[in-house]
Every structure is written in C-alpha cells, then in structure tokens.
C-alpha cells in the first residue's frame, strides 16, 4: 500500500496505489484511488511508467485523451468511466506483457489540489494447480499439474500424516514451455502414495503460490485449490 | 445518433491507389475514447481489420497490409481517410469504416460499406 | 497474429428453435471478444463485446460466454430476423481477427 501526497502544501491532496501482480496475456488492474470532487469536468488522472516517454494513459474533462498515449499501451488501457467521480482512478490493462512490469505513477489533479503515489507492478504467470491419481505410473501416484508459471517456480509436496516429511527424493517435477515461449506448464508426479490422507502440491514463485490438496480415502477423492498473491500483501 | 459514411471510387486500376474516406455525423471524431477504424470483406468471405487511427492522427495497421496502407484523419471536416497503394484483384472488396473502442475494442457503429473492385 | 476459428459453417434452425455457436482462438484471448451479425447487402452489427456483454439494443435472447479460447454465442429463441451470418473477433492482441463467420439458416 502506497500513498502519495501533494507537493505544495495545502493543495495536496491523498492518492492511495496498491501493488499488484499482471498475469501475462490476462488483463490486470493496476489500483489507484483519490480524494473525489464533486466535478467530473475538474478531475485529471495521469498513468505513467518508468522509462516510457509517452502516457500509459490520460484521462480529463470527463473523458480519455490518449494523444500522448505510448505505443506499446495503444488499444490495452480504461478507466473506469463511471467510478472516477467517487474517487477510482484505477487503469485496466489488456493482455498483459512482461514488458509491462515496472513502476507506475498514478498522478491526479482535481479542483482540491494535486497528488501522486507509486505502483509497483510485476508481471509473470500463475495458475490453479490440479491434483489427480496419476493411473499411468506403476505404482500409487499423484500428478499435480498447472499449465501456467512464470518465472521458473519451486514445486515441493507435503501430507497431512507425514508433516515435515521431505518428498523430493520421491517426486518428479518437470517444465514443459508454453507454445508462446515464455510460460511453462508445471508437472510434478509424487510416487507411493498411500490411502487415507492428504497430500499438498505447493507450487511458488517470487509473485505467487498456489497449493493443490487431493484427500484420498478409500471411498473417495477431494480436492482443493487455491493461489494467492505474494506481492499484494500491503 | 452517430453514423458513418464511406465514399470513392468504386473501381480502381491495378497498380494505383485506392482512396476513400469516412465522414462522421451525430458526434465528434475528437472523442477521446475511441479510435477510427477500416474493415474490408471481400465478396463472399470474412472480415478483415485493416488498421486505425485516433484523432491526435496516431495509427497502427495490420503488418499484412502495412506496407501499402496509409490512414489519416481531418478533424475539421470531421472525416477520416483510407490509401491502399499498388493495388490487385486480391484487394476487391466491400471496405467499411467504423468507431473503433479504445478498449475495450469493438467496432461499433459500421458505416454501410462500399465496394471497390480492382479492374483493368 | 490470432487465427479465429467458428464451427459450425451453416447452421440450420427452426424459428423458434435455441442456435448455439462455437469460436475458438488459436490461443487465449482473456475476454476480450466480440460477436457480430451481418444480414446479405448490410454492414455487420455488434452484438456482444467483452464476451459476455450485450450491446446496447441488443434483444436478451442473445446471450454470450467463453473465455480464454472457446467462446459461444446463443440465440435462446430464433426469431425471422436473426437469420444471418454470425462472426466473433478478438481484441486481446494486434492485429485484431475475425472467425470465418457462420451462416444461421432456416431449417
């Protein structure tokens, strides 16, 4: 959480960004909010990024100016029209790019004053991991599976029996490159399994982690994903 | 409401240049949220994007067409203009313009289109 | 660039009847989609965008969903004048695409 103020004393005013993560080729939001006028017509909103000569995007007088727009932001960018009265100066990003990742300045100026704040912004690839019995392997087996990370993640498996147990010397994981050359789907095969407990698949890298759980009992199957975002934690 | 209006020639020689332009009426080209685009279908087949531009007179264009293809706008008469240069029977088609989402990037509204035909 | 892929090529309903239609993308295209209808002799008009949202005017028993790179356009029920030919259209990347398009007949 990052907040920002105006330089020149009483006509300053609060702007509040929020680091967040682009997953590369989703469309991401990078998070901006102000101190709302009453006016539409007096509110600018200023994007703009480290290192890029034009603007990630502008908006004023009630509606976008994209002439001083960079190129490589052409076509992928909104505010949200309707929300910019109440304070949300947030931008949607299209189709996110590794390119994309760097520092971002969400700039305001309204009829109260002037303010800025930073954002960070990382882009890589996350994604859901699935847990299956793996019925190809000769023994017991679990395939945890994500088809999407970037960078290169860590895969370590764990069980609710067996807590603290190290399973890198019976698992296997391997990295097949997505056919867009930069993601990789995550394969990682945890050999003799055993009946009636938990097993977790932890997938992580320096933007997010996500765990796959499979409960095998004798009578059925769970199963449970979830992912979080390790760089939004203000 | 907002509408649009293709005009030019309906036939063109091989070789030369195809010109048309899309006038605008019902609303400005100097909106900020949207871009001005160019659409072609040739008889019988699909669609296909051939490029836009924004009032500031920015563009981008399809690299199938890049070479060829010049968009430009005149805010004063409210029009925007298409050049498809060195043109073949390939480039017969029904050429449309359209308002052109900033994003998101739907083309809505069409104007009516009209057909160019590429003949000696 | 993105190769747009709808299936079936024609479509023969029954006024009356629910048209489903398919769009693939060659790879993921998040939401950012469109789908459009053209009748012989008129330019094409936009039904859906953002996969899922309805134009303004359009009739309700159009309904869009998908996401990523299968997308599907339904007519819950046909009326006379939706008999037409159907296109989807990602934005997601430059240069932007269109599907082939499908032909929705009178059975």
């Known amino acids: 959480l990052i907040i920002g103020f105006g330089i020149s004393g009483r006509h300053s005013i609060t702007v509040t960004t929020l680091t967040s993560a682009g997953n590369i080729g989703e469309d991401g939001i990078l998070s901006c909010t102000f101190e709302p006028d009453i006016r539409l017509s007096d509110i600018v909103i200023q994007w703009l990024k480290e290192g890029v000569v034009g603007l990630v995007h502008e908006f004023k007088e009630g509606k976008d100016d994209l002439s001083d727009q960079d190129e490589m932001f052409r076509g992928r960018t909104a505010v949200f029209t309707d929300q910019v009265i109440v304070g949300n100066a947030s931008l949607r990003l299209k189709n996110v790019q590794l390119t994309d990742a760097g520092t971002y300045k969400c700039y305001i100026i309204t009829s109260k004053g002037k303010g800025n704040a930073n954002l960070e912004y990382k882009t890589g690839a996350f994604s859901m991991p699935e847990v299956n019995l793996d019925y190809n392997a000769s023994s017991e087996s679990l395939r945890c599976e994500a088809p999407r990370w970037f960078p290169q993640p860590t895969v370590v498996w764990a069980s609710q029996v067996d807590q603290g147990a190290n399973f890198s010397e019976v698992s296997n994981t391997s990295f097949e490159l997505n056919s867009e050359n930069v993601t990789m789907k995550v394969v990682s095969v945890l050999y003799n399994v055993t009946v009636n407990n938990t097993y977790s698949c932890m997938i992580e890298n320096d933007i997010a982690k996500a765990t796959g759980d499979i409960k095998v009992t004798d009578s059925e199957i769970k199963r449970r994903s979830s992912l979080q975002l390790l760089n939004s934690r203000a | 409401q907002l509408q649009l209006q293709e005009s030019g020639p309906g036939l063109v020689k091989p070789s030369e240049t195809l010109s048309l332009t899309c006038t605008v009426s019902g609303g400005s080209i100097k909106s900020g949220s949207y871009y001005w685009g160019w659409i072609r279908q040739p008889p019988g087949k699909g669609l296909e994007w051939i490029g836009n531009?924004?009032?500031?007179?920015?563009?981008y264009y399809n690299p199938s067409l890049r070479s060829r293809v010049t968009i430009s706008v005149d805010t004063s008469k409210n029009q925007f203009s298409l050049k498809l240069s060195s043109v073949t029977a390939a480039d017969t088609a029904v050429y449309y313009c359209?308002?052109?989402?900033?994003?998101?990037?739907?083309?809505?509204?069409w104007g009516q289109g009209t057909l160019v035909t590429v003949s000696s | 660039e993105i190769v747009m892929t709808q299936s079936p090529a024609t479509l023969s309903v029954s006024p009356g009847e629910r048209a489903t239609l398919s769009c693939r993308a060659s790879q993921s295209v998040s939401s950012n989609l469109a789908w459009y209808q053209q009748k012989p002799g008129q330019a094409p008009r936009l039904l859906i965008y953002?996969?899922?949202t309805r134009a303004t005017g359009i009739p309700a028993r159009f309904s869009g969903s998908g996401s990523g790179t299968e997308f599907t356009l339904t007519i819950s029920s046909l009326q006379s004048e939706d008999f037409a030919v159907y296109y989807c259209q990602q934005y997601h990347s430059f240069p932007f695409t269109f599907g082939g398009g499908t032909k929705v007949e009178i059975k």
């Open positions: 531009i924004y009032y500031s007179g920015s563009t």
């Open positions: 359209a308002r052109e989402g900033s994003y998101p990037n739907q083309f809505d509204p």
């Open positions: 953002g996969a899922s």
